[in-house]
């Protein structure tokens, strides 16, 4: 397992929510991406392929997510101070071989300005 801090902007704030960006290499064809908050699995998305270049997406722990050819974005809404924590992207690469797990993450700081519906 390879661990490290994300070397890109992992958290993008908008409208009282946050988009958590989990990147993977372009060459990866089949994978599982899990979003961990501390040690807890918040979200998970698996992309597999089949005959005729069919792609299948599976979400066991469903979060609003968005898949591109080199990243999975998970969206958390209605931010409050309890969301402040370490978040990790846990990537399991099935294809191409060899099987590999990488863990990258960072700390989500919550500032007043990022909270939804503040009282003025």
């Amino acid at each position: 397992e390879i661990n490290g801090s994300a070397n890109y902007e992992m958290f993008i704030f908008h409208n009282g929510g946050v988009q958590i960006l989990c990147k993977y290499p372009d060459i990866v064809q089949q994978f599982k991406m899990q979003l961990l908050k501390g040690g807890q699995i918040l979200c998970d998305l698996t992309k597999t392929k089949g005959s005729g270049n069919t792609v299948s997406i599976k979400s066991l722990k469903f979060c609003h997510s968005q898949l591109s050819n080199n990243s999975v974005s998970f969206f958390l809404y209605n931010l409050d101070h309890s969301h402040a924590n370490y978040y990790f992207c846990n990537l399991s690469i099935f294809d191409p071989p060899p099987f590999k797990v990488t863990l990258t993450g960072g700390y989500l700081h919550i500032y007043e300005s990022q909270l939804c519906c503040q009282l003025k």
Epitope: T48, S51, T54, S56, P96, P97, P98
Partner: antibody
Framework: EVQLVESGGGVIRPGGSLRLSCAAS????????MSWVRQAPGKGLEWVSG????????DYADSVKGRFTISRDNAKNSLYLQMNSLRAEDTALYYC????FGSGSYYNVPFDYWGQGTLVTVSS | EIVLTQSPGTLSLSPGERATLSCRAS???????LAWYQQKPGQAPRLLIY???SRATGIPDRFSGSGSGTDFTLTISRLEPEDFAVYYC?????????FGPGTKVDIK
């Protein structure tokens, strides 16, 4: 403990039909792609068919295409192979096999756990 | 379809010796989607190597795989009594997925 137990084999006349089953236990069945692999008596291994975790993508060897249908019932932790228009050359021990990674795919993944097989004999 | 050819058909060796098994593909096996299995009489196959060179869980390090493209090798560095069996290579990169005819490693 992971277990795959095949059943449904037997002696059948050419042109007949059989339905093989594979009962899975000891793991989360719908995390895995599954395949059927067969072995004729005294011969090597031949991949027959594969299916992904949810059953919406399947694939077949040319030798069985149009005659065999793979399916699964995740609620019952079971894999199936419907075999129609059977021929003498389909005589073999039929194994069900699980994808190694738990990727949910049968495609571009090797097989780790295999059952002990069920014997199909096609003879007149 | 990709045809896999294994050589030799039979390898007669003594315990403690080194075994080198070859698998040749009729066309390039993409991204090294090549596996090796061991099968003993009356048993189901057992995954040894995947991705041409990665050992499966629980496989002793005397088993190693190498190669890419069309030529692949399984090496058993020191044969143990339990290693005498039939070994199959398997390509899972192109459908239909295919197996080689097998190499039997028997006791000299």
């Amino acid at each position: 403990e992971v277990q795959l137990v095949e059943s449904g084999g037997g002696v059948i006349r050419p042109g007949g039909s059989l339905r093989l089953s594979c009962a899975a236990s000891g793991f989360t069945f719908d995390d895995y792609g599954m395949s059927w692999v067969r072995q004729a008596p005294g011969k090597g291994l031949e991949w027959v068919s594969g299916i992904n975790w949810i059953g919406d993508n399947t694939d077949y060897a040319d030798s069985v295409k149009g005659r065999f249908t793979i399916s699964r019932d995740n609620a019952k932790n079971s894999l199936y192979l419907q075999m129609n228009s059977l021929r003498a050359e389909d005589t073999a021990l039929y194994y069900c096999a699980r994808d190694y990674f738990g990727s949910g795919s049968y495609y571009n993944v090797p097989f780790d756990y295999w059952g002990q097989g069920t014997l199909v004999t096609v003879s007149s | 379809e990709i045809v896999l050819t294994q050589s030799p058909g039979t390898l007669s060796l003594s315990p403690g010796e080194r075994a080198t098994l070859s698998c040749r593909a009729s066309q390039s096996v993409s991204s090294s989607y090549l596996a090796w299995y061991q099968q003993k009489p009356g048993q189901a196959p057992r995954l040894l190597i995947y991705g041409a060179s990665s050992r499966a869980t629980g496989i002793p390090d005397r088993f190693s795989g190498s190669g890419s493209g069309t030529d692949f090798t399984l090496t058993i560095s020191r044969l143990e009594p339990e290693d005498f069996a039939v070994y199959y290579c398997h390509q899972y990169g192109n459908s239909p997925f295919t197996f080689g005819p097998g190499t039997k490693v028997d006791i000299k």
